[in-house]
Amino acid sequence: VPGEAEQPAPELVEVEVGSTALLKCGLSQSQGNLSHVDWFSVHKEKRTLIFRVRQGQGQSEPGEYEQRLSLQDRGATLALTQVTPQDERIFLCQGKRPRSQEYRIQLRVYKAPEEPNIQVNPLGIPVNSKEPEEVATCVGRNGYPIPQVIWYKNGRPLKEEKNRVHIQSSQTVESSGLYTLQSILKAQLVKEDKDAQFYCELNYRLPSGNHMKESREVTVPVFYPTEKVWLEVEPVGMLKEGDRVEIRCLADGNPPPHFSISKGNPSTREAEEETTNDNGVLVLEPARKEHSGRYECQAWNLDTMISLLSEPQELLVNYVSDVRVSPAAPERQEGSSLTLTCEAESSQDLEFQWLREETDQVLERGPVLQLHDLKREAGGGYRCVASVPSIPGLNRTQLVKLAIFGPPWMAFKERKVWVKENMVLNLSCEASGHPRPTISWNVNGTASEGDQDPQRVLSTLNVLVTPELLETGVECTASNDLGKNTSILFLELVNLTTLTPDSNTTTGLSTSTASPHTRANSTSTERKLPEPESRG
């Protein structure tokens, strides 16, 4: 074509896939009449007529552009809709008069790729691999033109490095003409890469300028051999009998090796393997003093069968032995004295305390309790507590019962019981003394006796309320080798309708449950007499 060498560079028109390209014919009036123009597309140096303008009227030629072309701007601009990557070519307009001139337009097409999809090697990377391994892949789909990929590790771009880092990128053309880029990052990783964050970045261009999209950050499973093995004990700090103790074997390798935990036997001086759970943890529950000793962990690499041994760890399970009190079952006369001595062994320094069982009152701080001029009230329980002050909760106790010789002692002297005729009463009477007393009743009925403790007895009597009984009342008598004592229960009639719900509550030490002779359950209440009780 004459004058082709002097042809100016084509005008550049940039447009995104799917949008409309406006191709403005840049011929001046002197170069041609815009009411008579032919439009061509040039592909592989072959020009194809795609549109004619005659007297300002446009007409598409049959072919790939037939449905997508229209005239705009009074015939000076050709609009190409639904642009595809295949439209990236030169378009030219040619004026027919006064002399044939042409104007060239280079259409450039762009499409942002989808978000990059990064995937990590699902099996992980061993640090001792002989060659760089596939670490991750990055796929950018449906971009145009082909985007560029940059790999990052901990925010820094990765460069090709012989035998260390290799980036292998390839692309495929989809039927749409868009490109899918796949980039594979191959690398030889080191132990420190176990926490490294990798991501890929796609760089692409749009008519608006340069852009980029980043993938999510990923970490790569890195496998490295164990170099160090150690033991950890939970809970930390002082251990005591009864605690749940976990002895855990730990290693700095990934995957963790196979562990075994052994305990030194002081008598044989040999290590004996302990049974661990599936996670290689030795659980001592409850911990006992026998668990004290020297523990160590052996880690096995099952591939190489090389083993590593941890530093031994001394485990001390603190204990307090059974507490011994002497005398174990003291008996004393009133007015005499008693010395109680408490003994126990422990892995730590012990503190002793004596407490009164009934009141929890501290009587003595120390292993020896001295009691003088014993009264009957001094009988009962004394508790020795042996504790380790430095380890809260580590203590043992022993209870000793002191018996004071004496005749029976009644829980009450007199008591009034509210009853209704023909009811079955449940009466109770309590007495204490040493030797332990027995209780008898002055009326016929079903009596049962139970020990409250070695010096105390409770007797219950089921009896039918009769007019005679109402008149005489009921007596219980407690007796032992040293004497006897009596309690009286006065029976008073009451109209059941006057009983309030509150009156079901029993007051005092004895209970009296009344029920009609017909065996329908009902309750009568006993109330203490207002005057003070005489005891004994």
Partner: antibody, heavy 116, light 106 residues
Framework: QVTLKESGPVLVKPTETLTLTCTVS????????VSWVRQPPGKALEWIAA???????YYNSAFKSRLTISRDTSKSQVVLTMTNMDPVDTATYYC??????????WGQGTLVTVSS | DIQMTQSPSSLSASVGDRVTITCKGS??????LAWFQLKPGKVPKLLIY???SLQTGIPSRFSGSGSGTDFTLTISSLQPEDVATYYC????????FGGGTKVEIK
């Protein structure tokens, strides 16, 4: 084109060792990893072991102590050995190519029966 | 280990029907999921990789969707040659397969 073919004994006695060979063509073992997958009759697929393009080996922890995977790049072969075979190991054994992390080509499989 | 739960375990549909198989992961696997077709005596065939990418040479009636934990394989118009068992497989951490779905023609 890419092909993989499994070969090995069809019958193995309990406690014996199974050796399976996967012979590949159309690609290099230094470019793609290979996995072994099995399917017991009437059951789902189960991944067994893999060898990467770099030669690293990986095993399903359920079999770990019984398995060895290796390759001979010059013969384009991947070999799987499985010791102490049991009737529950009766299955169709497949080898499959990695691309790079999913399996794009498989062999047709070989049925191994474990029986005395 | 990541578990993959596939449903249904079997289905029967007519030629031309739209068929949907689902696969659920026990944890987020992003898009690291493939679908395979297994026919007795035939080489297993990769249909979909990266959750939604169609493998070269696979008919376009097959499509995959989903990400994270929930995935779907769709056959838009079931054909007689699609009778097979279909498996999903995750490759996010190790490799595990779903239990399979047997597809039959009514």
């Amino acid at each position: 084109q890419v092909t993989l073919k499994e070969s090995g004994p069809v019958l193995v006695k309990p406690t014996e060792t199974l050796t399976l060979t996967c012979t590949v063509s159309g690609f290099s073992l230094t470019s793609n990893g290979v996995s072994w997958v099995r399917q017991p009759p009437g059951k789902a697929l189960e991944w067994i072991a893999a060898i990467s393009s770099g030669g690293s080996t990986y095993y399903n922890s359920a079999f770990k102590s019984r398995l060895t995977i290796s390759r001979d790049t010059s013969k384009s072969q991947v070999v799987l050995t499985m010791t102490n075979m049991d009737p529950v190991d009766t299955a169709t054994y497949y080898c499959a190519r990695h691309r790079p992390f999913y399996f794009d080509y498989w062999g047709q499989g070989t049925l191994v029966t474990v029986s005395s | 280990d990541i578990q993959m739960t596939q449903s249904p375990s079997s289905l029967s549909a007519s030629v031309g029907d739209r068929v949907t198989i689902t696969c659920k992961g026990s944890q987020n696997i992003y898009k690291s999921l493939a679908w395979f077709q297994l026919k007795p005596g035939k080489v297993p065939k990769l249909l979909i990789y990266d959750a939604n990418s169609l493998q070269t040479g696979i008919p376009s009636r097959f499509s995959g969707s989903g990400s994270g934990t929930d995935f779907t394989l769709t056959i838009s118009s079931l054909q007689p040659e699609d009778v097979a068992t279909y498996y999903c497989q995750q490759y996010y951490s190790g490799y595990t397969f779903g239990g399979g779905t047997k597809v039959e023609i009514k």
